[in-house]
Amino acid sequence: YHGCPSECTCSRASQVECTGARIVAVPTPLPWNAMSLQILNTHITELNESPFLNISALIALRIEKNELSRITPGAFRNLGSLRYLSLANNKLQVLPIGLFQGLDSLESLLLSSNQLLQIQPAHFSQCSNLKELQLHGNHLEYIPDGAFDHLVGLTKLNLGKNSLTHISPRVFQHLGNLQVLRLYENRLTDIPMGTFDGLVNLQELALQQNQIGLLSPGLFHNNHNLQRLYLSNNHISQLPPSVFMQLPQLNRLTLFGNSLKELSPGIFGPMPNLRELWLYDNHISSLPDNVFSNLRQLQVLILSRNQISFISPGAFNGLTELRELSLHTNALQDLDGNVFRMLANLQNISLQNNRLRQLPGNIFANVNGLMAIQLQNNQLENLPLGIFDHLGKLCELRLYDNPWRCDSDILPLRNWLLLNQPRLGTDTVPVCFSPANVRGQSLIIINVNVAVPSVHVPEVPSYPETPWYPDTPSYPDTTSVSSTTELTSPVEDYTDLTTIQVTDDRSVWGMTQAQSG
């Protein structure tokens, strides 16, 4: 046994952890055969020359969440076996040139959550084996050309949460092995053509929460392996027709929180692997035919919180695998009876917070697997006869906050609700708006014998109970499905983020199943 500093804990002598505010300098003596050293939550403010000189076998060094603001250039001398170095969550403003010299085995370098103002090509010129470089959460305003030129093996680079206002088109040109590039939460207004051309192995590109207004038409044309592209919360007002044409591997695309006004047919695709498309919080006013027709595998399409007032009957052509469609909080007044006809696998549809006055009787005709329909807060006075007849899996139907007209024509809907209540959850009950004598009364307990006759033909056909199960017992009252936890945005699955915020904000999703991808 080679001894362990009193302020540290050593497990099997090769793993050392030193924590606590009483520590103000690197503890000594450290076991010479230590392979992992963690110095966390201390009051160390500086690293002097060679504090780790006698532990040359060290493979992983974490110096995190300290008061560290100054490092001597030779602080990491003699650590030739070091593969993982984290200086994250300190107070570093400047990195001395040559700090990482001699770290020939270094593969992961974490400098995130400091106060770094700049980086220079000389900082990383010796780190030829580096695979992961984390620089997010600093104060970087620009990246000089050549900063990463020697990092030819780099696979993951995170520059998010800095103050970058522009990117040189040459800065990433030598990073042919890069798989993940994160530039989220900066101040980028545009990205020059060619910036990503050298990134032929890129799988994830995170550009969300910048101020990008325009995308160059060929910006992603060399990124054939891209799987995840995050463009949300920018200022993008239009998409060049060919911008997404060369992304056959893409399976996640987020465009929510932009200023998109229209989507041209064929803009998305071909993207045979795209599973989710997030377009909420834009200014889209209409959806033309075939706008999503290349997205054959799409399962989640979020179009809520736009200004959509018109959907062409063929807008959803090709979406045969779609499971979730969110159209809530738009300006829809009418829907064509065939608009959802192609969505044979649709399970959840949210249409709440629109201006729908009526629905065609065949609106859900081919969507036999629907489990949840949200129609609350529209202008519906009644629903067509038999609209839900065939929906044997329906177990959540929200109809409240509509101006239901409770004359005798409402009886079929009222009966359908009553006979199917064990399958429809326990949500807020629909309430009559007219005529005046029943205003405010629950639609399902109005006195049918004083219901005002309608002005239409007296013989009213009715909703059969759905589904008819002559040979099975009725549903138990546990059939009400699914959590209504909803995400405000897709979880962008960053392993280097310490926390991922998920909220219960129903205003965005309007869905019954939270999708985290």
């Epitope: 005798s408 079929p412 009725s474």
Partner: antibody
Framework: QVQLVQSGAEVKKPGASVKVSCKAS????????IHWVRQAPGQGLEWISY??????KYNERFRGRVTMTRDTSTSTVYMELSSLRSEDTAVYYC????????WGQGTLVTVSS | DIVMTQSPDSLAVSLGERATINCRAS??????????MNWYQQKPGQPPKLLIY???NQGSGVPDRFSGSGSGTDFTLTISSLQAEDVAVYYC?????????FGGGTKVEIK
Amino acid sequence: QVQLVQSGAEVKKPGASVKVSCKASGYTFTSFVIHWVRQAPGQGLEWISYIYNDGTKYNERFRGRVTMTRDTSTSTVYMELSSLRSEDTAVYYCARDYYFDYWGQGTLVTVSS
Amino acid sequence: DIVMTQSPDSLAVSLGERATINCRASESVDYYGISFMNWYQQKPGQPPKLLIYAASNQGSGVPDRFSGSGSGTDFTLTISSLQAEDVAVYYCQQSKEVPYTFGGGTKVEIK
């Protein structure tokens, strides 16, 4: 006014079937559920089934023995109970609407050998 | 099945006095915030008559002295001032789920 008029009393032997009718008038026939309920002599009420727009739901206790049908042209609902046994002796009522707001006068079915 | 238990089995009340009948369900009969509990009156030789639906709503033509209350599993039918014509058997019934089930009945007589 709303009326439900049922067919007359029946006497049946065990194992036989009985078909009771319920003719509705005074309202839009297709807009309401029709239930069947029975009451054995001196006993309480037991729900059998309902029919609505040709769809039916049955009490499990009667499944396989009871069949409900309707004829919209005559606004009539029929309830047929098969494989009769003595304990099926009861007054059989039809009733309208989900909340059973109007009832027929009842049909006494006696099962006796 | 939901089991409905009525109490008392019989009740003798003076004319003009209040009569109270209780009904307990073996599980909640609430949905949408509404209690699917109904009350019926049956006089000898007659079919039942709807008095109260959805716990507290009066059926058509039912005198105001009949009222219903309760939620969840416990419900009450109250006749505020018993009249001679109120002598009958009273049944509670749940219509929350199939099979719709009735209580055993409470016979109300004049003391």
